[in-house]
């Protein structure tokens, strides 16, 4: 669709005569009839296939024609067409004399024609005017013409329709050739696709308007490039949504089981060495001078009763010192100057002479020991307590203080981990040397049968448009990770249609 425009500029008829040569009385009151038609090698009469237009009386004899486009649009003359401009045309311009006010063809005498010109040729669509001048024996006509496209029509033939818009169906203006020019922030063939926030992850994020970044399920962060771990994940991370990959030293489905008690809790005191020995289990190796499960008890060096023959022990900063009874000497009072005559055996011990009376030996009653039967038997010296238990002398007897997880007189019994019914959902518990194991009934899994093993929610292929399906173990549901251009809980909506989120 377009308009052929004809601008009449000057008409010269100096003698004021008609085509017949007869003069007009009193002068030639001149108006024009224009016929636009398809290209003809020889312009002949017939229908004006592209349109016709007439002017009012524009002047008498010779006159210039005023540009009147602003005041009513009479000059240039408009010949609209609603078809593809063919690029060629024929044009007939007739100048007529109007004796009266009625300009209809049937109201004029046939000899009222002043002049007639006919041209034909090629004409491309464009803003520039083509100037032309046609001269006959008695008259001269100067004019210019052009073809322009109607509003919203573009291209070499005015055949391309383009109407700027900024709505759901597109966000663009039109280029001179009719191609779309997207408004800032929009892209795509029809400028319907928003340009997301710079850096927004192509798969994990999307947008419904420019410069935003909306995250698909399981992703978060300004650019939707951070995955959300499995709900309940305590000491773990993810590389894809709903994962729980445990940090160093943690285990279990939710990474909530402490496998590195030594590092996380530092239970061993006084510079002892800590060794992990299972979940929440550890062993402390004490430095000299310390004892106890956590090496929390300071040992006196005299506790080992190093002084013999009734010597008394005194603690010193750099060790101990033995004060020997009369008749004995040496670091531990181990050397004797006595004989049986001096009654050296204590606690009812019997004395036996040796080396012709130069020496002696004591035979001690039960519960006593030492070269002079001066020491009570330490029932702990044989380390009777198993599994790292601590031995304590209690008068004539002894007892073992057991580490957590052990019981019995000598800490020889492993406390049953199954006693507290740790297996969920009717799981069967089995005691192991270093912990326990649950045998789960159908439909449950995990270390403690705490995880409901669902039918794979993704088995029915619920996601559309080649989306990736994830099963959310905590809820027995699926999550669809949509490819670019689709949204919705099943990726069923192309971007542009309003999705409904379950927020």
């Amino acid at each position: 669709s377009g308009v052929f425009q004809l601008q009449l500029q000057e008409f010269i008829n100096e003698r004021g005569v008609l085509a017949s040569g007869r003069p007009c009385e009193p002068g030639c009151r001149t108006f024009f009839r224009v016929c636009l038609k398809h290209f003809q090698a020889v312009v002949s009469p017939g229908p004006c296939t592209f349109g016709t237009v007439s002017t009012p009386v524009l002047g008498t004899n010779s006159f210039a024609v005023r540009d009147d486009s602003s005041g009513g649009g009479r000059n240039p003359l408009q010949l609209p067409f609603n078809f593809t401009w063919p690029g060629t045309f024929s044009l007939i311009i007739e100048a007529w004399h109007a004796p009266g006010d009625d300009l209809r063809p049937e109201a004029l005498p046939p000899d009222a024609l002043i002049s007639k010109i006919a041209i034909q040729g090629s004409l491309a669509v464009g803003q520039n005017w083509l100037l032309d001048e046609q001269t006959s024996t008695l008259t001269r006509l100067r004019y210019s013409y052009r073809v322009i496209c109607s509003d919203n029509y573009y291209g070499d033939n005015c055949s391309r329709l383009c109407k700027k818009r900024n709505d759901h169906f597109g966000h663009y203006v039109c280029q001179p050739d009719g191609n779309l020019s997207c408004l800032p922030g929009w892209t795509g063939e029809y400028c319907q696709q928003p340009i997301c926030l710079s850096g927004c992850h192509e798969q994990n994020g999307y947008c419904s308007k420019p410069a935003e970044c909306l995250c698909r399920p399981g992703w978060q962060g300004r650019l939707c490039n951070e995955c959300i771990p499995h709900n309940g994940c305590r000491h773990g991370t993810c590389s894809t949504p709903w994962q729980c990959t445990c940090d160093e030293g943690w285990g279990g489905l939710f990474c909530d089981q402490d496998l590195n008690y030594c590092t996380h809790h530092s239970p061993c005191k006084n510079g002892a060495t800590c060794s992990n020995s299972g979940q929440r289990s550890y062993t402390c190796t004490c430095r000299p001078g310390y004892t106890g499960v956590d090496c929390e008890l300071e040992l006196s060096e005299c506790d080992s009763n190093p002084c013999r023959n009734g010597g008394s022990c005194k603690d010193q900063e750099d060790g101990y010192h033995c004060l020997c009874p009369p008749g004995y000497y040496g670091l531990h009072c181990e050397h004797s100057t006595l004989s049986c005559a001096d009654s050296p055996c204590f606690n009812g011990g019997s004395c036996r002479e040796r080396n012709q009376g130069a020496n002696y030996a004591c035979e001690c009653p039960p519960n006593f020991t030492g070269s002079n039967c001066e020491k009570k038997v330490d029932r702990c010296t044989s380390n009777p307590c198993a599994n790292g238990g601590q031995c304590l002398n209690r008068g004539p007897s002894r007892m073992c203080r057991c580490r957590p997880g052990f019981t019995g007189t000598y800490c020889e019994l492993h406390v049953s981990d199954c006693a507290r019914n740790p297996c969920a959902h009717g799981g069967t518990c089995h005691d192991l040397e270093n912990g326990l194991m649950c045998t789960c009934p159908a439909g449950f899994s995990g270390r403690r049968c705490e995880v409901r093993t669902s039918i794979d929610a993704c088995a029915s292929s619920p996601c559309f448009n080649r989306a990736t399906c994830y099963t959310d173990l905590s809820t027995d549901t699926f999550v669809c990770n949509c490819p670019y251009g689709f949204v919705g809980s099943r990726c069923e909506f192309p971007v542009g249609l309003p999705p409904s989120f379950p927020w």
Partner: nanobody, 123 residues
């Protein structure tokens, strides 16, 4: 069920301070980015501040930059907003929310909201 419960709002003189808290439950708080949003009477929701899941990255709207501080305690499942040098134009209902969409300046679409706590700053 996801629950976000705000507290700490009240009436304060211009130039004063308040500390808002948001107690979270029903989800693994330490795995999610969190945000504060406010809504003044007769106006739409306005993003105030946001913090990433670990607490190391914070974001602030221009209007509150330098006056408000967002923080979180993942062990206590709690989000905080320390508001200093308060102005009458800070009067609004303040919500804590889980963001799920970002615009050029900050979060603008949210998965869950709390019920809000009223902050009134008098001149």
């Amino acid at each position: 069920e996801v629950q976000l419960v705000e507290s700490g709002g009240g009436l304060v003189q211009a130039g004063g301070s308040l500390r808002l808290s948001c107690a979270a439950s029903g989800f693994t708080f330490g795995s999610y980015d969190m945000s504060w949003v406010r809504q003044a009477p007769g106006k739409g929701p306005e993003w105030v501040s946001a913090i990433n899941s670990g607490g190391g990255i914070t974001y602030y709207a221009d209007l509150v930059k330098g006056r408000f501080t967002i923080s979180r305690d993942n062990a206590k499942n709690t989000l905080y907003l320390q508001m200093n040098s308060l102005k009458p134009e800070d009067t609004a209902v303040y919500y804590c929310a889980i963001p799920r969409g970002w615009g050029p300046t900050g979060p603008h679409e949210y998965g869950y909201w709390g019920q809000g706590t009223q902050v009134t700053v008098s001149s």
